[in-house]
Interface confidence: medium
């Protein structure tokens, strides 16, 4: 069967910056900002796009040693990320995979809402353990808050990039960070 769990959470961080840090660079950030939750992330195959397989290892003392995630979709425009847990962790005799969708939506106050959908694909008529859903939710919350704290403490990290016109750059068009933009306009 398929059991769907949906939740929402808020962040004070703007959507574009959060997507860049939490989703696109989570592999590097998570072990750095939340070593108590994730010890390492390694790419088994792929370059981060759809089809990429990642192995996420957990520190000793947590219930599972590792999980393998498969990236299914990365939508940079709509800040959407789909992936599936396909091996390790709770995957086994009763659970085939967990399909996850994270969408980060900008809010008028400059923060964001994360809309999260977790679909548990069980084998036969097995049900999902409530504690598994709770543990997964808590892990997500731990990672999000750790990334959020990092971003609050490092205001220059993962800033949105702006496309500067050829005119502004004297015929050269390129992606430029806000920090570079500040520098460019003052020199």
């Amino acid at each position: 069967g398929v059991f769907n769990y949906e939740t929402e959470t808020t962040s004070v961080i703007p959507a574009a910056r959060l997507f860049k840090a939490f989703i696109l660079d989570g592999d590097n950030l998570f072990p750095k900002v939340a070593p108590q939750a994730i010890s390492s992330v390694e790419n088994i195959e792929g370059n981060g796009g759809p089809g990429t397989i990642k192995k996420i290892s957990f520190p000793e003392g947590l219930p599972f040693k590792y999980v393998k995630d498969r990236v299914d979709e990365v939508d940079h425009t709509n800040f959407k990320y789909n992936y599936a847990v396909i091996e390790g962790g709770p995957i086994g005799d009763t659970l085939e995979k967990i399909s996850n969708e994270i969408k980060i939506v900008a809010t008028p106050d400059g923060g964001s809402i994360l809309k999260i959908s977790n679909k548990y694909h069980t084998k036969g008529d097995h049900e999902v353990k409530a504690e598994q859903v709770k543990a997964s939710k808590e892990m997500g919350e731990t990672l999000l808050r750790a990334v959020e704290s990092y971003l609050l403490a490092h205001s220059d990290a993962y800033n949105e990039q702006k496309l500067i016109s050829e005119e502004d750059l004297g015929g050269e068009q390129k992606l430029i960070s806000e920090e570079d933009l500040h520098h460019h306009h003052h020199h």
Epitope: V12, I13, T107, G111, E141, S149
Partner: antibody
Amino acid sequence: QVQLVQSGAEVKKPGASVKVSCKASGYTFAAHYMHWVRQAPGQGLEWMGWINTYTGGTNYGQKFQGRVTMTRDTSITTAYMELSRLRSDDTAVYYCARDRRNWNFVFEYWGQGTLVTVSS
Amino acid sequence: DIQMTQSPSSLSASVGDRVTISCRASQNIKNYLNWYQQKPGKAPKLLIYEASNLQSGAPSRFSGSGSGTDFTLTISSLEPEDFATYYCQQSFSIPWTFGQGTKVEIK
């Protein structure tokens, strides 16, 4: 430990404005939304709005739009709520409240309250 | 706006009694329901969040249940310090709204 300390009681005339402050300590100020909730004498609780303390963006309850302004000063970890064009029915205790930062807007920590009396 | 209706509006009970307070939402709010305790002249205190989760520091005699539109706060065995007013609050959609309160008085 987390503390929210509000400014003292105010007495205002109808038509005037009042600005209430809420000094936060014991946590990362910018990581949490700050909400304002009021309670008229002998009445229930009424949510007025929030401020995103990181971006400064606000979300006001429709009832208060156009009359309320929420601001913050991150350098002194203080949030402010200003209510203009006061009427007698704005007489209430005004609370600031910090959210819990879980998957839900929950008012986990509250200031001690500021009594605002509107009287001619 | 979502209306929150509590019942009863007040009740009298004795120390040691089991007390239940109901809260009904005007539409489905899933489990986005929180309970607060307020004593006279004091700020409210969070007791239960997300319908059934006990806030850290809140006594274990308090419990919450329900989902959708109907919710219950239960005090398993009333203590003298539990005489107060209790409010439910929905955080499913803006504006966040509270119930009108239930005052628990000494019999």
